[in-house]
Interface confidence: low
């Protein structure tokens, strides 16, 4: 069974998939559609790297631009380095500025809803 066939079989279960399953899926050439991606748990999407999301979506990665103001894409963008987002070439804005350090402080995020940024 190829990656696409496997994806079709498990598509209906993906809404609650944890991060590790999504990371594994990104290596299987599944080309997840945007509608499915938008239904994923935000907390499962946030830890994914730009490269992992790009592999997960395949040719559908361009759809991130249309969804950049909506969860989970909006929250995921806020967690990525702007440099990394720029490699997608989609004009996604709102990433962590170059030279900033991300402190993964759960309390800070609970209060503000965004990662804590330290300047250079």
């Amino acid at each position: 069974m190829n990656g696409s066939e496997y994806f079709v079989k498990i598509q209906s279960f993906l809404g609650g998939a944890p991060t590790e399953d999504l990371k594994a899926l990104s290596q299987q050439n599944v080309s997840m559609d945007l509608a499915t991606f938008m239904k994923l748990r935000t907390d499962a999407v946030l830890p994914l790297t730009v490269a992992e999301v790009q592999k997960l979506l395949g040719p559908h990665v361009e759809g991130l631009k249309a969804e950049e103001r909506h969860r989970p894409v909006r929250d995921w963008i806020l967690r990525q380095r702007q440099d990394d987002l720029d490699t997608l070439g989609l004009g996604l804005q709102g990433g962590i500025p170059n030279g900033y350090l991300v402190l993964d402080l759960s309390m800070q995020e609970a209060l503000s809803g965004t990662p804590c940024l330290l300047g250079p």
Partner: antibody, heavy 120, light 107 residues
């Protein structure tokens, strides 16, 4: 902001060659294929070929394979399309259009076009 | 090569009315289709990719649908600025190919 600035209009004699340039800015040049598409007066758009600026790899439309050469100058973020053995039916507007290497080639950005006129 | 056949060649629609353009691929291209708008003397402008996704900044009156071999671009309420030629393009396989274009005018 993505910008693609093409060289100016050219008038050529049949049998001659023409080299059109496309200077790119606003994105990472080596992260995008550069495609060339032409449009003869009143005709449909016609894909000619592309080049991967990172690897130098290319694909050509068989129709042009022996006459077209697509190259890049990475240091200048510029792509070139050279068409040889020109004939009157090569009179057309030639466009450059990039697409992100990791996705399928839909063209969100286009150069302004370069008119090439072939006339004796 | 995959041949993209558009219909109709031209279309006259009243302002505020719906315009529908069809594109048929000679073989299955999945949803690997884009739609472009071209006004006289201008470069093509991307409207839709992956058959149904609008590019950023494209008004929501433009929508795309279809998969496999049959695709449709719909302008739900035609505006004066929509007068143009519309092209479909398949990017399922090389060589990339375009439809012959549909000219949309105001009735």
């Amino acid at each position: 902001e993505v910008q693609l600035v093409q060289s100016g209009a050219e008038v050529k004699k049949p049998g001659a060659s023409v080299k059109v340039s496309c200077k790119a800015s606003g994105y990472t040049f080596t992260s995008y294929w550069m495609h060339w598409v032409r449009q003869a007066p009143g005709q449909r758009l016609e894909w000619m070929g592309n080049v991967n600026p990172s690897s130098g790899g290319s694909n050509y439309n068989e129709k042009f394979k022996n006459r077209v050469t697509i190259t890049v100058d990475k240091s200048a973020s510029t792509a070139y399309m050279e068409l040889s053995s020109l004939r009157s039916e090569d009179t057309a507007v030639y466009y450059c259009a990039p697409h992100y290497i990791g996705s399928r080639p839909g063209f969100a950005y286009w150069g302004q076009g370069t008119l090439v006129t072939v006339s004796s | 090569d995959i041949v993209m056949t558009q219909s109709p060649d031209s279309l006259a629609v009243s302002l505020g009315e719906r315009a529908t353009i069809n594109c048929k691929a000679s073989q299955n291209v999945g949803t690997n289709i884009a739609w472009y708008q071209q006004k006289p003397g201008q470069s093509p402008k991307a409207l839709i990719y992956s058959a149904s996704y609008r590019y950023s900044g494209v008004p929501d009156r433009f929508s795309g649908s279809g998969s496999g071999t049959d695709f449709t671009l719909t302008i739900s309420s035609l505006q004066a600025e929509d007068v143009a030629v519309y092209y479909c393009q398949q990017y399922n396989s090389y060589p990339l190919t375009f439809g012959g274009g549909t000219k949309v005018e105001i009735k």
